[in-house]
């Protein structure tokens, strides 16, 4: 009888099924959808999380479509193909043989095509801009306090190395969090900025992926910071390839 058997849960991913019957009596927590035994000491990849979300019972699924003015991720949810390490495959296709290329956060970066479409490599999203609007407060937050609190949040809750939080901008009521992480900067074991941004996005929508933790309770010097709108912009190391007709 081991400690693993007493506490066989996955703190970082509630979309798992856990059992204490792994090798040597270890706890194993398998992600819904993919069935992969995930690492519960860190964030699960966005690709495996989307796969789990799409495998959940339909009555438990809420299709959240981003604001029509956001030029990102406005295709909604899809059931992704993940590579052998849980990352998005560069080419994604649906059941009707419509295919498209995605970046490392799974956002479409080309026009849709057919099965002949080629996506030569998975292009890395190296810069993420999280644009928030907070609910009205008595006064503006102190910028340095806000900066410190958001950096603490990404470090402690999402386990993102502080060097990847490039900046926090604030012009009441808009907050912008810049995450930057080049391929060369990301070491083995580092949380990916795309995964951290996805966990944050789900947190602010009140759909936390963490097991048994309360929702996000953001406070700046005791004052609640309540987010009323979120937009996330993704910048890739190689610019996306959309035809001109999409821009008109």
């Amino acid at each position: 009888h081991t400690a693993a058997q007493d506490n066989c849960t996955c703190p970082t991913n509630k979309m798992t099924v856990c059992s204490p019957d792994g090798p040597g009596g270890r706890c194993q927590c398998r992600a819904l959808g993919s069935g992969v035994a995930v690492d519960c000491s860190t964030l699960t990849s966005k690709c495996l999380l989307l796969k789990a979300r799409m495998s959940a019972p339909k009555n438990a699924r809420t299709l959240v479509r981003p604001n029509e003015h956001a030029l990102v991720d406005n295709d909604g949810l899809y059931d992704p193909d993940c590579d052998p390490e849980g990352r998005f495959k560069a080419r994604q296709c649906n059941q009707t043989s419509v295919c498209w290329c995605v970046n490392s956060v799974g956002v479409r970066r080309t026009d849709k095509g057919d099965l002949s479409l080629r996506c030569d490599e998975l292009v890395r999203t190296h810069h993420i801009l999280i644009d928030l609007r907070h609910r009205p407060t008595a006064g503006a937050f102190n910028h340095s306090d806000l900066d410190a609190e958001l950096r603490r949040l990404f470090r402690e809750r999402y386990r993102l190395h502080p060097k990847f939080v490039a900046a926090v901008h604030y012009e009441q009521p808009t907050i912008q969090i810049e995450l930057r992480q080049n391929t060369s900067q990301k070491a083995a074991g580092d949380v990916d900025i795309g995964d951290a941004a996805y966990y944050f996005e789900r947190d602010v929508k009140g759909e936390s992926l963490f097991q048994g933790r309360g929702g996000l309770d953001l406070r700046v010097r005791g004052e609640p910071l309540q987010v009323e709108r979120t937009l996330i912009y993704y910048l890739d190391e190689i610019p996306p390839k959309f035809s001109m007709k999409r821009l008109t």
């Epitope: 081991t2 400690a3 693993a4 506490n7 792994g22 090798p23 040597g24 270890r26 706890c27 194993q28 927590c29 992969v36 035994a37 995930v38 690492d39 519960c40 000491s41 052998p84 390490e85």
Partner: nanobody, 120 residues
Framework: QVQLQESGGGMVHPGGSLRLSCAAS????????MSWVRQAPGKGPEWVSY???????YYPDSVKGRFTISRDNAKNTLYLQMNSLTPDDTALYRC??????????????WGQGTQVTVSS
């Protein structure tokens, strides 16, 4: 990029044997723990064997004494020898780059799998 390619699956009669292989590339195979995981139709995945980089092996009770996991580090290949097969062993078998933490079993990468069908 990690790649794991299984082979050796097929149809076999109850009581028969099969040997599965998994060719690994894109990582230091000799320094990695590996496992075999199977998924039967309509059931969840279950690990059926585990081998550490040093050669220590683990098996669940369901296959103990019938299955043997081994590795050839010179060939970057993982094996699973399966004897005394029963219809309950029918499943998709995939190999995984895995590890054990203090409390958890984790799969860091996995193959597409090879189908094993045991039927009379």
């Amino acid at each position: 990029q990690v790649q794991l390619q299984e082979s050796g699956g097929g149809m076999v009669h109850p009581g028969g044997s099969l040997r599965l292989s998994c060719a690994a590339s894109g990582f230091t195979f000799s320094g990695s723990d590996m496992s075999w995981v199977r998924q039967a139709p309509g059931k969840g995945p279950e690990w059926v064997s585990y081998i550490t980089s040093g050669g220590t092996t683990y098996y669940p009770d369901s296959v103990k004494g019938r299955f043997t996991i081994s590795r050839d580090n010179a060939k970057n290949t993982l094996y699973l020898q399966m004897n005394s097969l029963t219809p309950d062993d029918t499943a998709l078998y995939r190999c995984a780059k895995a590890r054990l933490t203090d409390s958890h079993y984790v799969e860091d990468a996995w193959g597409q799998g090879t189908q094993v069908t045991v039927s009379s």
